[in-house]
Interface confidence: medium
């Protein structure tokens, strides 16, 4: 029950996280104009990964896309790539984790298969979250660098007369959304990995001993792996082997609370 709850919660947390990463990537407020010491107050400039917007005091907003790669910081391309990779990995992870959920039955999928899928999706969520956090952090670093450069260059011109005031930009809402979303996706991924450990049927450490068990405690019966995992007609919770026809490496025996050796 705890495993199912952990897996389900991990899925939900990751789902919220990935939705947040998508939202952050699409948002225009990655950087917002710092209004300190700005002589023209009727307009407010903010910028995203894809376009730059200007909002007037009247509320009118105009946005223009970055239709050229020229003039764009190289780091912006890296941030875009990180966010997109994060979204793609997260989306694939969600798809995989849906089929891995313990509460969803798909045919006769084994617990071991579900465990592997849970682990895979968990790793994908972790990498997705790290990509988002890295992307947002790179952009934030770019902003901080630009802010202090702008501050240093704020007053330039001839004869002490202010000619140009470089606009300073501060952290926009999208950065905080991205950090939180990346963190949630990361946490969700960790939860999925933890759930995977509970889902995986533990391999017994005494397989060799099982083969030398006394005759009265083991019923030899055909049925193979199907029987040994409870899908067959074995109702007495006893281990069933297929007559020892397979090698020790081929046969997986799983302990239960009713196993006695």
């Amino acid at each position: 029950m705890a495993v199912t709850a952990c897996q389900g919660l991990g899925f939900v947390v990751s789902l919220i996280g990935i939705a947040g990463i998508i939202a952050a990537t699409c948002m225009d407020q990655w950087s917002t104009q710092d209004l300190y010491n700005n002589p023209v107050t009727a307009v407010f400039n903010y910028q995203g990964l894809w376009r730059s917007c200007v909002r007037e005091s009247s509320g009118f907003t105009e946005c223009r896309g970055y239709f050229t790669l020229l003039g764009l910081p190289a780091m912006l391309q890296a941030v875009r790539a990180l966010m997109i990779v994060g979204i793609v990995l997260g989306a694939i992870g969600l798809l995989v984790s849906i089929f891995a959920l313990k509460c969803i039955r798909i045919g006769s999928m084994e617990d071991s298969a579900k465990a592997n899928m849970t682990l895979t999706s968990g790793i994908m969520f972790i990498v997705s979250g790290l990509c988002a956090i890295a992307g947002v952090s790179v952009f934030a670093n770019m902003l901080v660098t630009n802010f202090w450069m702008s501050t240093a260059n704020m007053y330039t011109g001839m004869g002490g007369m202010v000619q140009t005031v470089q606009t300073r930009y501060t952290f926009g809402a999208a950065l905080f959304v991205g950090w939180v979303a990346g963190g949630l996706t990361l946490i969700g991924g960790v939860m999925m990995c933890i759930a995977c450990r509970g889902l995986a049927p533990e391999e017994t450490n005494y397989k060799a001993v099982s083969y030398h068990a006394s005759g009265h405690s083991v019923a030899y019966k055909p049925g193979g792996f199907k029987a040994s995992t409870g899908f067959g007609s074995n109702t007495k919770n006893k281990k069933i082997y297929d007559g020892g026809a397979r090698t020790e490496d081929e046969v997986q025996s799983y302990p239960s609370k009713h196993d006695y050796v």
Partner: nanobody, 122 residues
Framework: EVQLVESGGGLVQPGGSLRLSCAAS????????MAWYRQAPGKGREYVSE???????DYADSVKGRFTISRDNSKNTLYLQMNSLRAEDTAVYYC????????????????WGQGTLVTVSS
């Protein structure tokens, strides 16, 4: 490089009128807003009026009803029509423009002109 050049200043009698112009030239992707500031002798720079690209205007209380700001987007030019001038309007008038000179991030700047002197005296 973007340049702002003011013109139209001069000597005028109290109650008279003047029209100031500010022309922006250079590598301009878009002028988002333009404003007029003034600096009286021995005083700090004071806000007068501003106008956005869509024509929304704002004025300082001291000039409301007397000054009118306008702009010609096609010519990248800002105007300030000053009527009913008073002695306290004597100052160097500066033009400021919030400009995005090129398509890209962190390119926006606020540019200033060199100023034009307006003297109101009888």
């Amino acid at each position: 490089e973007v340049q702002l050049v003011e013109s139209g200043g001069g000597l005028v009698q109290p109650g008279g009128s003047l029209r100031l112009s500010c022309a922006a030239s250079g590598s301009i992707y878009r002028i988002n807003a333009m404003a007029w500031y003034r600096q009286a002798p021995g005083k700090g720079r004071e806000y007068v009026s501003e106008i956005t690209s869509t024509g929304n205007t704002d004025y300082a209380d001291s000039v409301k009803g007397r000054f009118t700001i306008s702009r010609d987007n096609s010519k990248n030019t800002l105007y300030l029509q000053m009527n009913s001038l008073r002695a306290e309007d004597t100052a160097v008038y500066y033009c400021a423009a919030f400009i995005i000179p090129s398509v890209g991030m962190f390119t926006s700047r606020t540019y200033w002109g060199q100023g034009t002197l307006v003297t109101v005296s009888s």
